[in-house]
Interface confidence: low
């Protein structure tokens, strides 16, 4: 019926939070009455989402009022017998619309929970539930789908061609064929969606509906769509059986006739010809924060959200802290501007990520007699003999590269290194073989290579 701020709760807030237009969705969840209410427990008896969702527009400064809710019912199909006692959970979700909404697009505004006792086939029960600062006015009832009847929908009453002991027009029931269905309580033809009855043969209308069978919307005097005017006593009639009779659309989908067939407008989270496939598609607008929705290439995902910079998650619902990846080098300060990242560099560094070292040679001297060389936007040290590293602070081991050939021994020396050659070799690095006949020494072939190998001497 309505949802809004409760009475006497200070300055009333609007469900739209004065942030432009919004829509309210209601998720109804039924749980067994015997189980302890727990957030994580399943909606074992059934769950459904509201489908008739108008957009509420308001402006800052307007006085907040309860939002009227549309007539669309939230149908919760339940499996097996109706338990009578159950827990009713109603969640009110707000979807913020508009480009400048800011903050999360979806918010859970209220969650009301209560134990209920209700027999199937009874009248609408009205209720008001308050949670925090919000107040929800609603009605609920339980109905059996034919051929089930009874307070628990446990008996199936079907028409039979064979004679039965039931009265005229009444059907025998299984699994108790001796029992007969109860006489119809409401007036025959009373709209199951918009009418109810508390006395036999009556038809009372819910708000917004009128006519003896509650089939005429109050807002219109003429008949809608393909309905044809009937006698004054009956308001509008449907012209015989149609494709939408019995509502072939599951999960709260709304049916419309299209050239002899039907089409289901499915609620958010359902798709398929009869809305019986559960899952979200791009048509449901699942991508938040400006994410682009694309039909999933992977058959396991009905859609894929391509997120704008700064957002991540399967629905682009999470803001990325891009600075946590520490993209700025050399101690630069990271700034996330939303559309881009900016690095504020320390003195002596530059570049989009502070990756360029601008220090000149005047800034830092090279140790141990090294010489500073500038070039290419950076500086380096040319180290004195026996030293290495970025600032020539590391003592070099001249023998580390094994410079002495043919088994010569290397000795580190203040001016570099000295090679003590093995017998039969000579030279600064022991690279020459000594000929026993006194001829000139020749470069010795490395081990494993023949003296005459042309590759060696080309």
């Amino acid at each position: 019926h309505s949802f809004g701020p409760g009475p006497g709760l200070g300055t009333p807030r609007s469900p739209c939070n004065a942030r432009g237009p919004c829509r309210l969705f209601f998720r109804v969840c039924l749980k067994p009455g015997v189980s302890q209410e727990a957030t994580e427990s399943l909606c074992a008896l059934g769950a459904a989402l509201s489908t008739s969702v108008p957009v509420y527009t308001e402006h800052p400064g307007e006085s907040a009022a309860a939002l009227p809710l549309p007539d669309g019912l939230v149908r919760v199909p339940f499996r097996d017998a109706w338990p009578g006692t159950f827990s009713l959970v109603i969640e009110t979700w707000r979807e913020q619309l508009g480009e400048h909404a800011g903050g999360p697009a979806w918010n859970l505004l209220a969650r009301v929970v209560g134990r209920r006792r209700l027999a199937a086939g009874g009248p609408w029960a009205r209720d008001v539930q308050r949670t925090g600062t919000w107040e929800l006015h609603f009605s609920y009832r339980a109905r059996c789908e034919p051929p089930a009847v009874g307070a628990a929908c446990a008996r199936l009453c079907r028409s039979r061609s064979a004679p039965s002991r039931c009265g005229p027009g009444l059907r025998p029931c299984t699994p108790f064929p001796d029992e007969c269905e109860a006489p119809s309580v409401c007036r025959p033809g009373c709209s199951p969606e918009h009418g109810y009855c508390e006395e036999p043969d009556e038809c009372r209308c819910l708000e917004g509906w009128t006519g003896p069978l509650c089939t005429v919307p109050v807002s219109t005097s003429s008949c809608l769509n393909s309905r044809v005017p009937g006698p004054a006593s009956t308001g509008c009639l449907l012209p015989g059986p149609g494709p939408c009779d019995g509502n072939p659309c599951a999960n709260g989908g709304s049916c419309s006739e299209t050239s002899g067939s039907f089409e289901c407008a499915c609620p958010r989270g359902f798709y398929g010809l009869r809305c019986e496939v559960s899952g979200v598609t791009c048509a449901d607008g699942p991508c938040f924060n400006g994410g682009l929705c694309v039909g999933g290439e992977d058959p396991d995902s009905a859609y894929v959200c391509h997120c704008p910079p700064g957002f991540q998650g399967s629905n682009c619902e999470k803001r990325v802290d891009r600075c946590s990846l520490q993209p700025c080098q050399n101690g630069g300060l990271c700034l996330d501007l939303g559309h881009a990242l900016r690095c504020r560099c320390r003195a002596g560094f530059a570049g989009p990520r502070c990756e360029h070292d601008l220090d000149d040679c005047a800034g830092r001297a090279c140790a141990n007699g090294g010489t500073c060389v500038e070039g290419g936007g950076s500086r380096r040290c040319s180290c004195a003999l026996g030293f290495g590293g970025r600032d020539c602070r590391e003592r070099a081991d001249p023998c580390a590269s094994r410079p002495c050939a043919h088994g010569g021994r290397c000795y580190a020396h203040f001016s570099g290194l000295v090679c003590a050659c093995a017998p039969g070799y000579m030279g600064v690095r022991c690279e020459f073989a000594v000929r026993p006949d006194g001829a000139d020494a020749v470069p010795a072939a490395p081990r494993g290579l023949r003296q005459a190998d042309p590759q060696r001497f080309l």
């Epitope: 399943l42 010809l273 058959p299 396991d300």
Partner: antibody
Framework: EVNLEESGGGLVQPGGSMKLSCVVS????????MSWVRQSPEKGLEWVAE??????????HYAESVKGKFTISRDDSKSRLYLQMNSLRPEDTGIYYC???????WGQGTLVTVSA | NIVMTQSPKSVSMSVGERVTLSCKAS??????VYWYQQKPEQSPKMMIY???NRYTGVPDRFTGSGSATDFTLTIRSVQAEDLADYHC?????????FGSGTKLEIK
Amino acid sequence: EVNLEESGGGLVQPGGSMKLSCVVSGFTFSNYWMSWVRQSPEKGLEWVAEIRLKSDNYATHYAESVKGKFTISRDDSKSRLYLQMNSLRPEDTGIYYCTSNRFAYWGQGTLVTVSA
Amino acid sequence: NIVMTQSPKSVSMSVGERVTLSCKASENVGTYVYWYQQKPEQSPKMMIYGASNRYTGVPDRFTGSGSATDFTLTIRSVQAEDLADYHCGQSYSYPFTFGSGTKLEIK
């Protein structure tokens, strides 16, 4: 590389129980609805059960023939899918495959034989 | 339950020939139809999803088509490695169901 590996199959007597396990790697297990599918020469490929995500309260669906007998479950922290099978009958014999929900990814299967 | 009926039960083709496999649904399933290839002693492998979309890594000689109740898998030029059983399946409504398969043999 995507990999699904089932285990826990074997020979069991009619009326007995068995728990199948499937470990998944190569994709984000917690983001995928998962199913078990079985195959036998008599019935061909037969969908058994499905489990959805944590955000769906791990909602499950079952084939009519296994409802009340089999329980599908998952452990997202271990990337594991399970199928607890009770009151097994000879007609439950077959190769049981662990699959992603719309059957894009399949394991190699584990053979379950129900026989006296 | 939606029944998926495949025909023919088996087909024998020579390398290079074109083959068409049929799958009929007992009621409208939109385009929520998949084709799987199952080679001997292997698990099924997805070939086509959404009736006509080729799955990652599937050669372009495989083509899926159809909607509502009639679906077709066409192999443009059969290769020796295509010897396998081909299954169709629907995920339009619960319970998901599969066809009994078509065996493709190579002459």
